[in-house]
Amino acid sequence: HSFGPGPGLGTPRSPCNARGPCRLFFRVCLKPGVSQEATESLCALGAALSTSVPVYTEHPGESAAALPLPDGLVRVPFRDAWPGTFSLVIETWREQLGEHAGGPAWNLLARVVGRRRLAAGGPWARDVQRTGTWELHFSYRARCEPPAVGAACARLCRSRSAPSRCGPGLRPCTPFPDECEAPSVCRPGCSPEHGYCEEPDECRCLEGWTGPLCTVPVSTSSCLNSRVPGPASTGCLLPGPGPCDGNPCANGGSCSETSGSFECACPRGFYGLRCEVSGVTCADGPCFNGGLCVGGEDPDSAYVCHCPPGFQGSNCEKRVDRCSLQPCQNGGLCLDLGHALRCRCRAGFAGPRCEHDLDDCAGRACANGGTCVEGGGSRRCSCALGFGGRDCRERADPCASRPCAHGGRCYAHFSGLVCACAPGYMGVRCEFAVRPDGADAVPAAPRGLRQADPQRFL
């Protein structure tokens, strides 16, 4: 919520150090609550760096004040079950952007460490931590990724319809009737099959789907040269401007697209979101995650970060675990079980790597002689006579559509249906009115049409 000088702690300083504009980054590190491992320094439960980073503009002589922090969440994905007890480490890093006092620099301003006890699914917990002359106000919570539920996120929820104590719109889980499915945090109406969210009220689309609620299939076509399919009958369109167009990375940095934004891989000696920061030395503490800084005694000589296991990047800023290669397809969640990896698939997908699309004809056959028909990015079964339902597993009720006209009674039969017609009507569907004078039967007029309307009998 805010970061700044604590009350009554000597001469108040500003996080920007009165050196002009600066940015604050927050690195969150989760460790096991009780760790017997020698790898005490590793963030074994997970780590993340803040991404919503505004520039704070401040000038020498201004009175110091706490800086309001942006609302952007710092999401730390944790692997396996949530332990409940954990150590929370929050580092506050300053990136100085001004030209005063030697130019840009990175500094670790504060590092707060504390043991916490927290069940997943609970409300936000507020906290204030002081370290040295700094004070950090923040909130934190633990949340399970569906379909995991429970205080430890260790149970997988298969929702079922049944009377329960669950809140409105939430259903109990099979086989844990006392557990309720996790409430949806996505934008209302976001497609559960083709959309997902990482933050409340957003809706991100899986490959092949688009639209604000991910309900519009992206039409495929034979467009060549990486052109994208255009609207019907317009051929192909050139892709719109991408985040890397014009290469926003300075100083020889290489740009890669990451979910609608971009990421710069900076050459040694440069840092910042666009590799715009230079002249960094080891004294500025540029190596994250316990990386060892070597060289770089002065701004002209490049430093090198030697990263601890599990981290890479020119500043050890990227966590590299065995899930980094993204083995799970179609938005599946990768879990490292120690001896191997496993994928937790999103709804509508199955297989060890979530590679089978259950909404795809290749994924599952239609029963009882039904045929699978694909279209619009989904599949449906066209069922044989006498069968119905999504997979043609249900015996169809031939009388459900009330096929017998004029009050005729319908009887289901092994070969279809039989109509017992009301007096004065005849035909397979009781569609003919019987003339009392013995003349030929004529189709009975539907209600609202006169018997003699010519357009009815052309």
Partner: antibody, heavy 120, light 107 residues
Framework: EVQLVQSGSELKKPGASVKVSCKAS????????MNWVRQAPGQGLEWMGI????????IYNHKFKGRFALSVDKSSNTAYLQISSLKAEDTAVYYC?????????????WGQGTTVTVSS | DIQMTQSPSSLSASVGDRVTITCHAS??????MGWLQQKPGKAPKGLIY???NLEEGVPSRFSGSGSGADYTLTISSLQPEDFADYYC?????????FGGGTKVEIK
């Protein structure tokens, strides 16, 4: 039958580039990562990097960052290793080796190796 | 990076001998390691995965054991075709690393 067939030997001059291919058959290409391993003459094995053919995501040994690039062509079930600005010390046998993407197995099948000689 | 220290670097043995090669990791790797065999001029071949599981088609005289940071490859009765170089490899963490190798020679 699972097979990884690599391209033939290459003789290159320093500063040139080389692209080594590894064609996979007998299994679902996108279900297995492809590792690349280097063996200099008379030396042991050195892991260079790994690529997920499904997503194209790569991870490199920091020793092999910069001049070395891994890629795949899913349509032909082929993985590639490209080395640019060749140096004499790049002279080695380069192997591709598949690995189950859920890490249930180690590097079970290997290509026959491609000898790259860099000499002026 | 995880260091894999393999010993011995070479050994001489006779047909029928029991041979043991060890590999020590610089930190625990939870069984995420394998053993490879390489004959002169040939590509390596997988023998053992997950510390103790035999790859398909590998004779049962080969066995692997160990946990934590220490692992062993045993050849219960050495055969003429077993004279080769043997390597351990860890895949617990990137970058993967190999042991220095053990050359098994005829006595």
């Amino acid at each position: 039958e699972v097979q990884l067939v690599q391209s033939g030997s290459e003789l290159k001059k320093p500063g040139a580039s080389v692209k080594v291919s590894c064609k996979a058959s007998g299994y679902t290409f996108t279900d297995y990562y492809m590792n690349w391993v280097r063996q200099a003459p008379g030396q042991g094995l050195e892991w260079m990097g790994i690529i997920n053919p499904y997503s194209g995501v790569t991870i490199y040994n920091h020793k092999f960052k910069g001049r070395f690039a891994l890629s795949v062509d899913k349509s032909s079930n082929t993985a590639y290793l490209q080395i640019s600005s060749l140096k004499a010390e790049d002279t080695a046998v380069y192997y591709c080796a598949r690995q189950d993407s859920l890490l249930d197995y180690a590097m079970d099948y290997w290509g026959q190796g491609t000898t790259v000689t860099v000499s002026s | 990076d995880i260091q894999m220290t393999q010993s011995p670097s070479s050994l001489s043995a006779s047909v029928g001998d029991r041979v043991t090669i060890t590999c020590h990791a610089s930190q625990g790797i939870s069984g995420n390691m394998g053993w490879l065999q390489q004959k002169p001029g040939k590509a390596p071949k997988g023998l053992i995965y997950h510390g103790a599981n035999l790859e398909e088609g590998v004779p049962s005289r080969f066995s692997g054991s160990g946990s934590g940071a220490d692992y062993t490859l045993t050849i219960s009765s050495l055969q003429p075709e077993d004279f080769a170089d043997y390597y351990c490899v860890q895949y617990a963490q990137f970058p993967y690393t190999f042991g220095g190798g053990t050359k098994v020679e005829i006595k």
